[in-house]
């Protein structure tokens, strides 16, 4: 069985303030089941950007249809980016757990910084 | 429907301590930032403090700074803001507010907790 | 750290003759600014989002405009219930989160 890995290409994203982030995030293995969450930052100060299994993340769009059961492909689109959401981010696979999910694997990370200001 | 009620405030004189707590229903506590912000009498919106969804990220306005600690427990649904070292300047309304989306406006407020630091 | 400065601080107005509220920012705030409404003795309440969006349940006499450093909420058509006082918070630079300093709206 293959290993998972957490495919972020992007080590750089140049984002424009108050367009729209596109952070890509690809897995290479169904296994272990269990979602995949994004955050900003590592460690217990890290921030919650998305979780698809509960919350609201009216910012956060997915790039593909996470409920079918095959889908590998987990990139977000963040809107409406301001100079608070600069940072990196990291997609994170968690295994499913009880009571609760367990962390075994992170991206890379991307981050996210400011470039040009629109013209 | 979203629901937050503070308890813990009262009268204290300089110097002491209080602990404030602000029990969330409605909506799923873990996945978002909570903010503390005061109003004192005849006066206008102060914030606070602020606590990241997984507990571990915190900020503080700096006539706070040191003083007081902010906390929560995901498994009780409730946030705590820990008041040390009270000065009559603290005396206010305390509400507790709960954040859209980890980096966003606050979308819902507590009825309020009244804290008065007299001698 | 980006000042919210609201105008005029009290604004008397009669039933139905409009109201207009304006909050300057010292520097850009881009679209990310909301308002609050806090009526005497109880909670703030959401009113406005991303300067012009409307919060669940709130009436469409509301509405917001504005963006970078000039906002104003309108009431259209106020009623007696909207004796408030009114708050601007902005959300693009933080921490601090600053809240402005506030307009009270008489219904005459």
């Known amino acids: 069985e293959e290993e998972l890995q957490m495919i972020q290409p992007e080590k750089l994203l140049l984002v424009t303030v108050g367009k729209t982030a596109t952070l890509h995030c690809t897995v290479t293995s169904l296994l272990p089941v269990g979602p995949v969450l994004w955050f900003r930052g590592v460690g217990p100060g890290r921030e919650l950007i998305y979780n698809q299994k509960e919350g609201h993340f009216p910012r956060v769009t997915t790039v593909s249809d996470l409920t079918k059961r095959n889908n590998m492909d987990f990139s977000i689109r963040i809107s409406s980016i301001t100079p608070a959401d600069v940072g990196t981010y990291y997609c994170v696979k968690f295994r499913k757990g009880s009571p609760e999910n367990v962390e075994f694997k992170s991206g890379p990370g991307t981050e996210m910084a400011l470039g040009a200001k629109p013209s | 429907d979203v629901q937050l009620v503070e308890s813990g405030g009262g009268v204290v004189r300089p110097g002491e301590s209080l602990r404030l707590s602000c029990a969330a229903s409605g909506f799923s506590f873990r996945s978002y930032a909570m903010n503390w912000v005061r109003q004192a009498p005849g006066e206008g919106l102060e914030w606070v403090s602020r606590?990241?969804?997984?507990?571990?990220?915190?900020d503080y306005a700096d006539s706070v700074k040191g003083r007081f600690t902010i906390s929560r427990d995901n498994s009780k649904n409730t946030l705590y803001l820990q008041m040390n070292s009270l000065r009559a300047e603290d005396t206010a309304v305390y509400y507790c507010?709960?954040?859209?989306?980890?980096?966003?406006?606050?979308?819902?407020w507590g009825l309020g907790a009244l804290v008065t630091v007299s001698s | 750290e980006t000042v919210l400065t609201q105008s005029p601080a009290t604004l008397s107005v009669s039933p139905g003759e409009r109201a207009t509220l304006s909050c300057r920012a010292s520097?850009?705030?881009?679209?990310?600014l909301a308002w609050h409404q806090q009526k005497p003795g109880q909670a703030p309440r959401l009113l406005i989002y991303d300067a012009s969006n409307r919060a669940t349940g709130i009436p469409d006499r509301f509405s917001g405009s504005g963006s970078g450093t000039d906002f104003t909420l309108t009431i259209s058509s106020p009623q007696t219930e909207d004796s408030a006082v009114y708050y601007c918070q902005q959300y693009y630079y933080w921490p601090p989160y600053r809240f402005g300093g506030g307009t009270k709206v008489e219904i005459k």
């Open positions: 606590i990241n969804s997984g507990g571990g990220g915190t």
């Open positions: 520097q850009t705030v881009g679209s990310k």
């Open positions: 507010a709960k954040q859209y989306d980890w980096n966003s406006f606050f979308d819902y």
